[in-house]
């Protein structure tokens, strides 16, 4: 067979000839290649839309579930029914009511538990005589903490007042043992619930300085759209202090943020809500009960700069010109002021409440709920963008006593800052984190 | 939409009691504290008496303490107002009204108020 | 009780006239003041809280101002339906107190 000599088969090959020519690479991507392209820029484009679309929607408007439909965010937590089912009023500051004593709380007096007898409503302190593990995480738990307790052995005290019983369990919450004899150890509980108040870093007493994050691990920024609003105190992983009034303006949970473990205002990370708790309000003293808890959505991670602060004891009876500490991001001048971006400390003192209540301060409007604290010539308060944070009082460990609450002016002489006493308000704190638990 | 709507009030003599009831819709009613306040003919608005959302705070004006019981039931959305004693100077116009959820001092105020049901005491 | 007087306590007025109604104190209630709205044999509305806080739905022709003990309610430009009678209230201190009451009438 002749070979055609413009063939284009090479002469070594055994392949068969081609039908057709193969296309060259320009080609192949202008047929495949570019209409893949086009399909991706296409599909990139709308997902970039849908996005978008999702976005705005998010940020303005709320989807009410059955029937599908949107309603404009600022319809959320309004005190109206939007949605048929009423989802836009779900996820709302709630309110909870101050509820039933709790039967167990701590003395100042070491810690030591006490137990109430509910038939008599007295109050009997708890010998350690076959006081267990158990038993103390019932104590605890009736508090509505969560954590592993410790406890221990204390002596009893020569002015011990109240009788001391051996304490038993029944149905989750302790009681007094029937057959109650003697306490034969001679000692009482010391029960500690959480592991809280400690820092790293102790403050030095002068007027108003820099704060470090080391001194104070418990102070938080509680943030609406990323805007810093309110103070905050760390009480346990889940749970953070603050005042009620902080949410006055944005009722809704969404928006709400939590930024813990720096000095620096921007800097954090922040924390999401699962739900803002205020007590029960009282007509009869709109000012009272200026006191919110904050449930995180995840457990804090406890670091050198993440830290719990402690709860008051319940007898905490702190006496005029007991020195203090304030803190916070607030104002620096009361009026023309403005947000300061470093966390700033100062040592105050208990005010008297009869001079806090005098004419020429508050004329009465300081309730038993309430303490002031400032310095008797003024120049040292808590301003706006303050509330919410802690009063702190140091004894062995650091207590938040008062919640930074309001005041007329900021640091003027005879109206010192007016503080929510956080003792008041053990019973709700702890029947808060019992239900939920 | 927020609705408040009372019922009860009429003709009553002096001496006699009244209940008057006040159905609310349109918000979570177990979330709000909750005002009566009167107006009588050709006067301005007074406040009567308050109660908590929980019930737990209840207040009441010197002029009808120990005579009108307020009371509320979550579960069915309603406001009472049981009135006992009753006397000529009750004789209004009694509003169930919404207190605002401004949490801190300022908090009495009312932000809805229901039409309003008429309470004649007459011989 | 703390008193809650206004003035005057009644004015007549045309449509786009500009108004201007008091409340006076009779001790200081900071900014917890509110106004509110009622025509004949309706419920009050609640047009101003806070003194200067506008509530949803109203329109911006009202305004409030003022704090401690002396507060002012203004129409900027007096409609038709503005016609009523305007409440100032105290929620500084329990109980509640309201104001007399000013009629504004058509002139």
């Known amino acids: 067979m002749l070979q055609d000599p413009d063939s284009d088969q090479p002469l070594n090959s055994l392949d068969v000839k081609p039908l057709r020519k193969p296309r060259i690479p320009m080609e192949t991507f202008r047929k495949v290649g570019i209409p893949i392209i086009i399909a991706l820029l296409s599909l990139a484009s709308i997902i970039i839309v849908v996005v978008l679309i999702k976005v705005i929607l998010d940020k303005y408007y709320f989807l009410c579930g059955q029937p599908l439909h949107f309603i404009p965010r600022k319809q959320l937590c309004d005190g109206e029914l939007d949605c048929p089912l009423g989802e836009d009023e779900e996820h709302c500051v709630k309110s909870f009511p101050e509820g039933p004593a709790v039967a167990v709380r701590l003395s100042k007096d070491r810690s030591t538990l006490q137990v109430l007898d509910s038939a008599t409503g007295n109050w009997f302190s708890a010998c350690f005589d076959n006081f267990t593990e158990a038993l103390a995480e019932t104590a605890c738990r009736q508090m509505g903490y969560s954590s592993k307790p410790t406890f221990r052995a204390v002596e009893i005290g020569p002015d011990q007042d109240l009788d001391v019983v051996e304490i038993t369990e029944n149905s989750q919450e302790l009681r007094m043992r029937n057959s109650s004899g003697p306490c034969l150890s001679g000692s009482l509980v010391s029960l500690h619930c959480l592991a809280c108040g400690k820092s790293l870093k102790t403050p030095r007493v002068v007027g108003v300085e820099e704060a470090s994050v080391d001194s104070w691990p418990w102070q938080v920024s509680i943030q609406y759209d990323k805007q810093h609003v309110c103070g905050g105190s760390i009480l346990d992983p889940h749970w953070v202090l603050t005042a009620a009034h902080c949410f006055r303006k944005h009722t809704d949970v969404f928006n709400w943020k939590v930024r813990a473990g720096s000095d620096k205002l921007g800097s954090f990370p922040s924390l999401a809500v699962a739900k803002i708790i205020i007590i029960e309000f009282n007509p009869m003293y709109p000012k009272d009960n200026d006191i919110a808890l904050m449930k995180l959505q995840f457990p804090l991670t406890f670091s050198g700069t993440v830290r719990p602060i402690c709860l008051p004891f319940f007898d905490e009876e702190l006496t005029p010109a007991t020195p203090l500490w304030i803190i916070g991001w607030g104002f620096t001048k009361q009026n023309g002021g403005k947000m300061s971006d470093i966390l700033l400390q100062a040592s105050v003192q208990v005010i008297d409440s009869t001079r806090c209540n005098a004419d020429d301060a508050y004329q009465g409007e300081v309730t038993e709920k309430m303490m002031c604290a400032g310095i008797p010539e003024g120049g040292v308060d808590t301003c706006q963008g303050d509330s919410g944070g802690p009063l702190m009082y140091q004894s062995d460990q650091w207590h938040v006593v008062g919640i930074v609450s309001w005041g007329y002016g900021c640091g003027g002489p005879s109206t010192p800052g007016v503080y929510t006493k956080v003792s008041a308000y053990l019973n709700w704190i702890y029947n808060v984190w019992k239900a939920e638990l | 939409e927020v609705q408040l709507l009372e019922s009860g009030g009429g003709l009553v003599q002096p001496g006699g009691s009244l209940r008057l009831s006040c159905a609310a819709s349109g918000f979570t009613f177990s979330s709000y504290a909750m005002h009566w306040v009167r107006q009588a003919p050709g006067k301005g608005l007074e406040w009567v008496s308050s109660i908590s959302s929980s019930s737990t705070y209840i207040h009441y004006a010197d002029s009808v303490k120990g005579r009108f019981t307020i009371s509320r039931d979550n579960s069915k959305n309603t406001l009472y107002l049981q009135m006992n004693s009753l006397r000529a100077e009750d004789t209004a116009v009694y509003y169930c009204?919404?207190?605002?959820?401004?949490?801190?001092?300022?908090?009495?105020?009312?932000?809805?108020w229901g039409q309003g049901t008429l309470v004649t005491v007459s011989s | 009780d703390i008193q809650m007087t206004q003035s005057p306590s009644s004015l007549s007025a045309s449509v786009g006239d500009r108004v201007t109604i008091t409340c006076r104190a009779s001790q200081s209630v900071s900014s917890w003041l509110a106004w509110y709205q009622q025509k004949p044999g309706k419920a009050p509305k609640l047009l101003i809280y806070d003194a200067s806080s506008l509530q949803s739905g109203v329109p911006s022709r009202f305004s409030g101002s003022g704090s401690g003990t002396d507060f002012t309610l203004t129409i900027s430009s007096l409609q038709p339906e503005d016609f009523a009678t305007y409440y100032c209230?105290?929620?500084?201190?329990?109980?509640?107190?309201f104001g007399q009451g000013t009629k504004v009438e058509i002139k």
């Open positions: 209230q105290q929620a500084k201190s329990f109980p509640p107190t």
């Open positions: 009204a919404r207190v605002g959820r401004y949490y801190g001092s300022g908090s009495s105020l009312v932000d809805y």
